[in-house]
């Protein structure tokens, strides 16, 4: 008789999850010489220990603490790029502008990017059938708690001028319910961070509106200002040209507004 298994509303653990995490760790440590010392088997053991045999609706930040310790890494605090709902462009940008970092450019972010995982209470099995959905099931699930933990700590580490890339094509350019809006904004340290600079990325080719005047951007400005952090905003009208000019800043066409 098959054992009863909890059915959750979200997709199950990404197939070959252990192999993927281990392979990503090895690849990352090969690409980043300063992380060569990392023992990827220990990293996987710590990652696994955070959620295996635990109820997937009862995960805490403390569960991830052993993994956090192993993921210790130098990140220049004044070179941090946050993003919301525009991950691909943010990553394309840091691939070109190599001295800037998104969370996914760190070991811990790289390991977990785009993956889903959960276990089951009192068994050592990984659940490949379903995992809790943040809205429909519970917020304290393994994936949500992981990203909340690392996002909070990433924001806390930031200093000087912090940049955030926002998607100008969405109805809520700044969304209070996003990880950026609910976690990162509130964990920037006013004693360390002087300015949050938003880059609003335009989607339409002929879109010349000033999206920095959008009500949700004004809401972000208000939240940030109340935290004694200065706010600035720039429209990126041509994201393709923006990336091209990051690659080739000497190009004559790069002096005009992008």
């Amino acid at each position: 008789v098959p054992r009863w298994r909890q059915q959750w509303s979200g997709p199950g653990t990404t197939k070959r999850f252990p192999e993927t995490v281990l392979a990503r760790c090895v690849k990352y440590t090969e690409i980043h010489p300063e992380m060569r010392h990392v023992d990827c088997q220990s990293v996987w053991d710590a990652f696994k220990g955070a959620f295996i045999s635990k109820h997937p609706c009862n995960i805490t930040e403390e569960d991830y603490q052993p993994l956090m310790k192993l993921g210790t890494q130098t990140v220049p605090c004044n070179k941090i790029l946050l993003w919301s709902r525009i991950k691909d462009l943010a990553h394309q940008f840091t691939q070109v502008q190599r001295d800037m970092f998104t969370l996914e450019d760190t070991l811990l972010g790289y390991l977990a990017d785009d993956l889903t995982w959960c276990g089951e209470f009192n068994t050592s099995k990984i659940n490949y059938q379903s995992c809790p959905d943040w809205r429909k099931d519970c917020s304290n699930n393994p994936v949500s708690v992981f990203w909340k933990t690392v996002s909070r700590r990433f924001a806390e580490a930031a200093c000087d001028v912090v940049h955030v890339m926002l998607n100008g094509s969405r109805s809520k350019i700044f969304d209070k319910n996003s990880t950026f809006g609910s976690v990162e904004v509130h964990n920037l340290q006013p004693e360390k961070v002087q300015t949050l600079e938003a880059w609003v990325i335009h989607g339409g080719r002929e879109d010349s509106r000033d999206l920095c005047q959008d009500p949700t951007i004004k809401e972000l400005e208000s939240i940030i200002s109340k935290r004694n952090i200065q706010f600035s905003c720039k429209n990126i009208y041509r994201p393709d040209k923006f990336l091209q000019c990051v690659k080739n800043p000497e190009d004559s066409s790069c002096t005009s507004e992008i």
């Epitope: 220049p76 690392v150 700590r153 806390e156 580490a157 004693e191 360390k192």
Partner: nanobody, 117 residues
Framework: EVQVLESGGGLVQPGGSLRLSCAAS????????MSWVRQAPGKGLEWVSA????????DYADSVKGRFTISRDNSNNTLYLQMNSLRAEDTAVYYC??????????RGQGTLVTVSS
């Protein structure tokens, strides 16, 4: 701007002790958790210990648990690391940094601890 100055390192024999200090300025020291991290020659950054802003909560890497003690004096904006029963593998440059990690941008020059007979 966060500024820190580490001191107290030196050459010590295995089994010996040292007390590291970190003088902090440019921020409200008691508002921030603080950490000690270290970098051994030719190795990467390793987190050693952390302490909450009030000093009421501490945490240690397994490799130093029971040998090292982190503490702070908020009235003097100073962080300490008492290191006992030192081993050759504790040889490293020690840095203090704000926060509990895992992401650090240490601002000081660090202090070199060499454990050798």
């Amino acid at each position: 701007e966060v500024q820190v100055l580490e001191s107290g390192g030196g050459l010590v024999q295995p089994g010996g002790s040292l007390r590291l200090s970190c003088a902090a300025s440019g921020f409200t020291f008691s508002n921030f958790a603080m950490s000690w991290v270290r970098q051994a020659p030719g190795k990467g950054l390793e987190w050693v210990s952390a302490i909450s802003g009030s000093g009421g909560s501490t945490d240690y890497a397994d490799s130093v648990k029971g040998r090292f003690t982190i503490s702070r004096d908020n009235s003097n904006n100073t962080l300490y690391l008492q290191m006992n029963s030192l081993r050759a593998e504790d040889t490293a440059v020690y840095y203090c940094a704000d926060g509990t990690g895992p992401f650090f941008d240490y601002r000081g020059q660090g202090t070199l601890v060499t454990v050798s007979s």
